[in-house]
């Protein structure tokens, strides 16, 4: 029986050209984590494996950095980075847990404009 839950950073926005940290946290399970995958839609961004460490997909090597922890840092953001990101925890004996994050990358002026109007 799968008892674990994944907490994610949820829906987040960031400025074009900036960076963002994607984070997921698996809790409420004693299952052993063996690997964590980070994916964007159907593209693999990175893997953190218990025995092999981190692997960053070659096409993202210049813009993706592992960490902090099991999170992933996306750098030099473009509007094309807008979309769904998934953290996939492979565990034993539970199986797979998946968390979803939606990232919206905003044009600089739009992000600044939005921030101004969030201040009470």
């Amino acid at each position: 029986m799968m008892t674990g839950t994944i907490e994610t950073t949820g829906n987040i926005s960031a400025e074009k050209g900036g960076s963002i940290i994607l984070q997921c946290h698996l809790s409420s399970t004693t299952a052993q984590v063996t690997q964590v995958n980070w994916e964007q839609q159907d593209q693999l961004l990175a893997i953190c494996n218990a025995d092999l460490g981190w692997h960053i997909s070659p096409s993202f090597k210049d813009r993706v950095a592992p960490g902090p922890g099991l999170g992933l840092t996306l750098q030099s953001l473009t509007v094309n980075d807008t979309g769904e990101y998934f953290c996939i925890y492979h565990t034993y004996p539970d199986g797979t847990y998946t968390g979803r994050i939606f990232l919206e990358v905003l044009e600089s002026s739009v992000a600044e404009h939005g921030a101004r109007f969030q201040i009470p």
């Epitope: 907490e7 698996l26 809790s27 063996t34 981190w54 960490g67």
Partner: antibody
Amino acid sequence: QVQLQQPGSELVRPGASVKLSCKASGYTFTSYWMHWVKQRHGQGLEWIGNIFPGSGITNYDEKFKNKGTLTVDTSSSTAYMHLSSLTSEDSAVYYCAREGLYAFDYWGQGTTLTVSS
Amino acid sequence: DIVLTQSPATLSVTPGDSVSLSCRASQSIRNSLHWFQQKSHESPRLLINYASQSMSGIPSRFRGSGSGTDFTLSINSLETEDFGMYFCQQTNSWPYTFGGGTKLEIK
């Protein structure tokens, strides 16, 4: 098996610099973060910073930004920490530690740095 | 920076006793909290990662719990080899930080 080898001790003069080493073996050096941690006189642990050998990315605690510089030599699977303008406050045990899926799972034995004239 | 506060600073107990060590974070770190044991003149050893995951080879008497800001390391039926320093550490955000430690000593 995973090993992080550090020299046992270093003795340096005040005002001088030192380059501490941490030689990794038993795993793919470029796939794990390497961290450096300071411990004075058997007291608490202080995180200095980290480096990802696969890309050379570094992070530092603000307190150590002007004190330490982290580098790696991937050909020899060795991590280095260069400490400058040494004072007695820098006398401590310095550990390197690997971070992977299970956090700081392997540590070096530590190098005891003594700054004395 | 995230501050980790460990309590008590020192705990004097007898072998066979059970103890709970506390680590409190200045802000939520979800479950990115790890526990280390350090004996005199030795390197720290990872006991528990991500709040509750026991490392391979660690005796079952060590158990980690908590999330958010409050975490506990429980040790059931202490053995003489368990005495030493215990540190918590967060890896939720850089800079990573350690707690000040709890010294577990024989009464």
